[in-house]
């Protein structure tokens, strides 16, 4: 429905305080150099624009666009030019284009100093002082680093956050109320940062219609008792609220999230049976809750699948009448089926089948030709089971870090052009699937790690886009979204990677490690691993853990002496020429 | 399964010398730091010295430093402990031990594999 001025309209839907949150963010998303006071202010200019247009819809510019209105608004910044260089020449363009070179130059690795936590006693000060200042704050400096964070979604991270120091900051231990609070959000925060990159970075590189594949697939497993014709209506919806986020349109996006929830929980019945906590709770609590569901428990007595897609006689004929429907239904139904398979390999399968249906429905004889159809699925859905249980036995043998370590070396060999900090970020968070999914029973352990695993990957390919370094990875990363994981699994040791030339200065190590907590350490140990590998990709496992021992010890050591600095530059020498005569470099 | 056995154990003068030898059976030797601890009778098992996989890095409590000196043979899958200006106070059994590769390296539980130990007796 036409609204004569889409600002007013998103401003009464959202209410003032979300209106000015969503835009704080989608300018942060944006301008992700500029300091928070410049945001603010042009935030207010427009908030008090947008009162202007509800209380008259048809005064001056109140019938522009949001992107004509934002885009003229961002391009008021004085210092365009210079901290953002290029970006600036989006400024001569008009809408849509203007809009499109704006998302082209969002960082998702933007030159930003790390988030350094205060002192507990300093944050709830500056909450009590402006508890307004305190969580826009907040909502800039996550929107800025991620910027393509689920912009709703944050709303709903700042009201935890909000809430975690209105309750602590009156507690007798602060600290110990407070911290683990805000470490469970950095946690959960980074995760859904990562899993939104992935959906934008499918809508944006393969297109809607590989988004709404993805979503059918998911949206069938948890929730396996609504009819097809349901499950079709939620993911138009869905995808509508994703590619509006993924395209900077937030209020729009904040707004349809908001109608989608209201939808679901009117329609309980015809969805599923786990809806019914999440629908009492407030907006933002329910989209989220509804966004986490458990899986619905599956209808009893569902019927092959081979009777309507391998023996029907129909099967070209309903194919032929319309493709994406039919595999659409395919998918559905193999999906509520199968809870227990990773999202992706029911792509996979749903690809198989499309692929064997083009071929086949040319052929002599169809229903021959393609009456084997689901033998072709067993290697497929074989190939991650294999894998997961392999890597749960690694994960178990090894433990978290040492797992890491090793996934360290296998990708650094794979694809060693890589630069060490992205090499180091994905290997270690490739390892905490182990964690994450080897817990699980066998039915869980392959939704929960190959789709982790494909989140992990897209960050892998969203970095290297910025800067590509390696055809392998770029293959990897544009062939297939869905066979991303595989591609990977299969790469070998590069053998074209010219060795790294030692530098000494890579190794050497001071005593500012000891006051690191011990993740940074660990990252230090890790990088370090890297560059061993880079530098001697043919190192064997036995070496590369030799001298990391070698390391460890040397750490431990210096970190307990008198003189540290003077114990980190002697063992150091030592260190090093070990390491060189164990290697041979 | 890794097996550490250790020698060279004796009756010796104060003042005198002795020589500890561990040999280790399986590959992970070779990847681990190593490390010996002693244990009075009566007393807790108290660390003596480890030294890490490659051999670079050697360290040593303060009641032994400056006397006793680590060495391992990767190619022969053995440590040793060269004990000199041997005190009565260092009469016990003495056990050669493999790090489990990721925890301190001065505390007797994060080695996870131990030899039957060789006692030492020093006489005044």
């Known amino acids: 429905d036409a609204h004569k001025s889409e600002v007013a309209h998103r401003f009464k839907d959202l209410g003032e305080e979300n209106f000015k949150a969503l835009v704080l963010i989608a300018f942060a998303q944006y301008l992700q150099q500029c300091p928070f006071e410049d945001h603010v202010k042009l935030v207010n200019e427009v908030t008090e624009f947008a009162k202007t247009c509800v209380a008259d819809e048809s005064a001056e510019n109140c019938d522009k666009s949001l992107h004509t209105l934002f885009g003229d608004k961002l391009c008021t910044v004085a210092t365009l030019r210079e901290t953002y260089g290029e970006m600036a020449d989006c400024c001569a363009k008009q809408e849509p284009e203007r809009n499109e070179c704006f998302l082209q130059h969002k960082d998702d690795n933007p030159n930003l100093p790390r988030l350094v936590r205060p002192e507990v006693d300093v944050m709830c000060t500056a909450f009590h002082d402006n508890e307004e200042t305190f969580l826009k704050k907040y909502l800039y400096e996550i929107a800025r680093r991620h910027p393509y964070f689920y912009a709703p979604e944050l709303l709903f991270f700042a009201k935890r956050y909000k809430a975690a120091f209105t309750e602590c900051c009156q507690a007798a231990d602060k600290a110990a109320c407070l911290l683990p609070k805000l470490d469970e959000l950095r946690d959960e925060g980074k995760a859904s940062s990562a899993k939104q990159r992935l959906k934008c970075a499918s809508l944006q590189k393969f297109g809607e219609r590989a988004f709404k594949a993805w979503a059918v697939a998911r949206l069938s497993q948890r929730f396996p008792k609504a009819e097809f014709a349901e499950v079709s209506k939620l993911v138009t919806d869905l995808t509508k609220v994703h590619t509006e986020c993924c395209h900077g349109d937030l209020l729009e996006c904040a707004d349809d999230r908001a109608d989608l929830a209201k939808y679901i929980c009117e329609n309980q019945d015809s969805i599923s049976s786990k809806l019914k906590e999440c629908c009492e709770k407030p907006l933002l609590e329910k989209s989220h809750c509804i966004a986490e569901v458990e899986n619905d428990e599956m209808p009893a007595d569902l019927p092959s699948l081979a009777a309507d897609f391998v023996e029907s006689k129909d099967v070209c004929k309903n194919y032929a009448e319309a493709k994406d429907v039919f595999l659409g239904m395919f998918l559905y139904e193999y999906a509520r089926r199968h809870p227990d398979y990773s999202v992706v390999l029911l792509l996979r399968l749903a690809k198989t089948y499309e692929t064997t249906l083009e071929k086949c429905c040319a052929a002599a004889d169809p229903h021959e030709c393609y009456a084997k159809v689901f033998d072709e699925f067993k290697p497929l859905v074989e190939e991650p089971q294999n894998l997961i249980k392999q890597n749960c036995e690694l994960f178990e043998q090894l433990g978290e870090y040492k797992f890491q370590n090793a996934l360290l070396v296998r990708y650094t060999k794979k694809v060693p052009q890589v630069s060490t900090p992205t090499l180091v970020e994905v290997s270690r968070n490739l390892g905490k699937v182990g964690s994450k999914c080897c817990k699980h029973p066998e039915a869980k352990r392959m939704p929960c790690a190959e789709d982790y695993l494909s989140v992990v990957l897209n960050q892998l390919c969203v970095l290297h886009e910025k800067t590509p370094v390696s055809d392998r990875v770029t293959k990897c990363c544009t062939e297939s979204l869905v066979n991303r994981r595989p591609c990977f699994s299969a790469l070998e040791v590069d053998e074209t990677y010219v060795p790294k030339e030692f530098n000494a200065e890579t190794f050497t190590f001071h005593a500012d490690i000891c006051t690191l907590s011990e993740k940074e350490r660990q990252i230090k140990k890790q990088t370090a691993l890297v560059e061993l590998v880079k530098h001697k990709p043919k190192a064997t496992k036995e070496q590369l853990k030799a001298v990391m021992d070698d390391f460890a010890a040397f750490v431990e050591k210096c970190c307990k002496a008198d003189d540290k600095e003077t114990c980190f530059a002697e063992e150091g020498k030592k260190l090093v020429a070990a390491s060189q005569a164990a290697l041979g470099l | 399964q890794v097996q550490l056995v250790e020698s060279g154990g004796e009756l010796v003068q104060a003042g005198g010398s002795l020589r500890l030898s561990c040999v280790v059976s399986g590959r992970t030797f070779r990847t681990r730091t190593m490390g010996w601890f002693r244990q009075a009778p009566g007393k807790e098992r108290e660390y003596v010295a480890h030294?890490?996989?490659?051999?670079?890095?050697?360290d040593y409590s303060d009641s032994v430093k400056g006397r006793f000196a680590i060495s391992r043979d990767n190619a022969k899958n053995t440590v040793n402990l060269q004990m000199n200006s041997l005190k009565p106070e260092d009469t016990a059994v003495y056990y050669c031990?493999?790090?489990?590769?990721?925890?301190?390296?001065?505390?007797?539980?994060?080695?996870?594999?131990w030899g039957q130990g060789t006692q030492v007796t020093v006489s005044s």
């Open positions: 031990a493999l790090h489990n590769g990721i925890g301190v390296r001065t505390v007797p539980s994060q080695y996870d594999s």
């Open positions: 030294i890490s996989a490659n051999g670079p890095i050697t």
